[in-house]
């Protein structure tokens, strides 16, 4: 069998500064089993070096001097007895760039440098960024372990130093932020903020960093109801809104949360399984009615919990007046006025612009009031005949406005002219 020296190794390898690379390698050399068995030594040298005098970059021979600059960084990996010459290069440095050759020695007969199969190593600038690992999603209030590691880095060379920065870390002990791992308990306000891990090799100028934007899952903490872009005040999960009857109303409910809560509106104070009247945060009423006094509830449903706010509508209205209308009856002139308002209005009668209070002591007039449904009625009875043309007025008012109506009673005429005079405050 013809003696053969063969080396299988890639021609060139590129590694980023500060990272590691494993260069697979296998070799063969002529050896007869009946030979004696001196130890097998293998070496990696810088190209151009003379094997007999030069310091090696890596070897399995404990008696050979290793270059101080590659000590602990260039290592033989694998079993040389099984003809494995794989080379591990750690914490690569720019000055490592160059060619390397492999040499085998065994006893007096085997001494061979594989000059035809050189390994060309190129160290480039570090562009690799570290990876920040954590279990997603981050949940508000739940402690989560984060770790920072650089793909392609290894234990070789001086230790790595870490530093963490970000708003979410403000309460942490500075020492904690120098480890490759940290425990974070995120808050809702940390959502969308940046967290940066920076890595540096001690004694080297090589630094790299990665920034991630935190996606913190949190349930709604507050609900805000807006009317015309203005937030309503909320006390004990209830908001009070005075609104004019007949007015159109558009309300927007907002509950910051992540992921966004499902917003819906309900009539009154709903059961958990109630049907919404809007499946969004928008509630539109074409017209507020007195029936709306029951109010509405905005509910924010979220995987981490739900929140709801009751909107108590206080419906008010300007007085609406029907009348007065007058007719002659046995006991005298009978005038009626109907009015409707929220809150209930006050009403007064006037005769020739003079107020008629209660019932007259002389019995010349009598006032009666009653209510039925949303309407209240008041009647005025004037005893005796008319001496001249008379103007009878009734006026209703509440804190929001007033309305008055009058009738002109013409002496000797059966038809009575009426007129309504609205007056808003």
């Amino acid at each position: 069998e013809k003696p053969v020296y063969e080396l299988q190794v890639q021609k060139s390898v590129t590694v980023q500064e500060g990272l590691c690379v494993l260069v697979p390698c296998s070799f063969s050399y002529p050896w007869r089993s009946w030979y004696s068995s001196p130890p097998l030594y293998v070496y990696w040298f810088r190209d151009g070096e003379i094997p007999y005098y030069a310091e090696v970059v890596a070897t399995n021979n404990p008696d050979r001097r290793v270059k101080p600059e590659t000590q602990g960084r260039f290592r033989l990996l694998g079993d040389v007895q099984k003809k494995n010459c794989s080379l591990s290069i750690g914490d690569a440095r720019m000055e490592d760039t160059g060619s390397y050759f492999f040499r085998v020695e065994r006893g007096r007969d085997v001494k061979y440098s594989y000059q035809q199969n050189k390994l060309n190593l190129e160290v480039t600038a570090l562009i690799e960024k570290p990876d920040i690992h954590f279990l997603e999603p981050l949940e508000s209030g739940r402690p989560t372990r984060l770790s920072c590691s650089l793909p392609g880095s290894c234990e070789a060379g001086p230790p790595l130093t870490f530093s963490w920065t970000g708003n979410a870390l403000s309460p942490l002990d500075p020492e904690t932020t120098r480890s490759s791992e940290l425990t974070l308990t995120p808050r809702p306000e940390d959502h969308g903020t940046n967290l940066t891990c920076q890595m540096k090799r001690q004694g080297a100028q090589v630094t790299t960093e990665r920034t991630v934007q935190l996606n913190v899952s949190y349930a709604p903490q507050t609900i805000t109801i807006f009317r015309n872009g203005i937030a309503l005040e909320i006390l004990q999960n209830t908001s009070y809104l005075p609104v004019l009857e007949g007015q159109a109303l558009r309300l927007l409910c907002d509950a910051p949360s992540n992921p966004p809560a499902h917003l819906s509106w309900f009539q009154g104070s709903p059961a958990l399984n109630a049907t919404p009247i809007s499946n969004t945060g928008i509630l539109e009423l074409r017209r507020v009615r007195s029936a709306e006094e029951g109010g509405f509830t905005c509910r924010a449903q979220h995987p981490l919990g739900f929140l709801q706010i009751f909107l108590n509508l206080s419906v008010y209205s300007l007085p609406q007046l029907l009348g007065p209308s007058c007719s002659w009856e046995a006991e005298g002139l009978h005038c009626r006025c109907s009015f409707r308002a929220r809150p209930a209005p006050s009403l007064c009668w006037r005769l020739e612009e003079k107020p008629l209070e209660g019932n007259s002591s002389q019995g010349s007039f009598k006032v009666n009031s009653s209510s039925a449904g949303p309407w209240a009625n008041s009647s005025l009875i004037l005893h005796g005949g008319l001496s001249s043309d008379l103007k009878v007025s009734c006026k209703a008012w509440n804190i929001y406005g007033s309305q008055s109506g009058s009738v002109l009673l013409l002496q000797g005429r059966s038809n009575l002219g009426t007129g309504v005079v609205p007056a808003a405050l």
């Epitope: 007949g246 509106w265 074409r286």
Partner: antibody, heavy 122, light 113 residues
Framework: QAYLQQSGPELVKPGASVKVSCKAS????????MYWVKQSHGKSLEWIGY????????RYNQKFKGKATLTVDKSSSTAFMHLNSLTSEDSAVYYC???????????????WGQGTLVTVSA | DIQMTQTPSSLAVSVGEKVTLSCKSS????????????LAWYQQKPGQSPKLLIY???TRESGVPDRFAGSGSGTDFTLTISSVKAEDLAVYYC?????????FGSGTELEIK
């Protein structure tokens, strides 16, 4: 509970007109729109229009413009539909129906009157 | 105008059977502001006024038995009667109230075998 009571059947001659009434009870008439629907014999339903009882505003299906006029009398809580220039095509059952919640001008018909049969025949 | 198409026009079923009635609209009935489908289902028994069963495509009107269920969104809607009873003999109409003029389907007549 809302209840709508419609006027009785009408037999009218072609060219004449008819006024169908719908009295509302159990709720405030002005709080809800009142819809009117036509159902010809053995046929589906057709929306005629609605009246906003609060302000008297109306909206009609183009097909019934000029044929139907909707009005309301708040004092008696009654809605009316006046049909004019009647032909045999107008023979049908006419329903009044109240909307559901009264929040939107586009709502379902929650309560129906019993229907008024109008027969147009010479 | 929005066209409402109901299928089948009639069907005969036995008591206890499950029934599915279909209604398709010529355009989407989903209102973006409140994410509700503006569709209603009515039941009209012989000689009676229509009665509301379902509104907003899936909300059962109070007092309607829970064997009636509405589903669907956009343009395709379904009324399901989980176990038909003899009293369910009627014509069932779907109606859109998304845009004027409001329109009804031509109805599905449910007969009991």
């Amino acid at each position: 509970q809302a209840y709508l009571q419609q006027s009785g059947p009408e037999l009218v001659k072609p060219g004449a007109s008819v006024k169908v009434s719908c009295k509302a009870s159990g709720y405030s008439l002005t709080d809800y729109n009142m819809y009117w629907v036509k159902q010809s014999h053995g046929k589906s339903l057709e929306w005629i229009g609605y009246i906003d009882s609060y302000n008297g505003g109306t909206r009609y299906n183009q097909k019934f413009k000029g044929k139907a006029t909707l009005t309301v009398d708040k004092s008696s809580s009654t809605a009316f539909m006046h049909l004019n220039s009647l032909t045999s095509e107008d023979s049908a059952v006419y329903y009044c129906a109240r909307e559901g919640f009264g929040y939107d001008d586009r709502e379902w018909f929650a309560y129906w009157g019993q229907g008024t049969l109008v027969t147009v025949s010479a | 105008d929005i066209q409402m198409t109901q299928t089948p026009s009639s069907l005969a079923v036995s008591v206890g059977e499950k029934v599915t009635l279909s209604c398709k609209s010529s355009q989407s009935l989903l209102y973006s502001t409140n994410q509700m489908n503006f569709l209603a289902w009515y039941q009209q028994k012989p000689g009676q006024s229509p009665k509301l069963l379902i509104y907003w495509a899936s909300t059962r009107e109070s007092g309607v038995p829970d064997r009636f269920a509405g589903s669907g969104s956009g343009t395709d809607f379904t009324l399901t009667i989980s176990s038909v009873k003899a009293e369910d003999l009627a014509v069932y109409y779907c109606q859109q109230f998304y845009s004027y003029p409001f329109t009804f389907g031509s109805g599905t007549e449910l007969e009991i075998k």
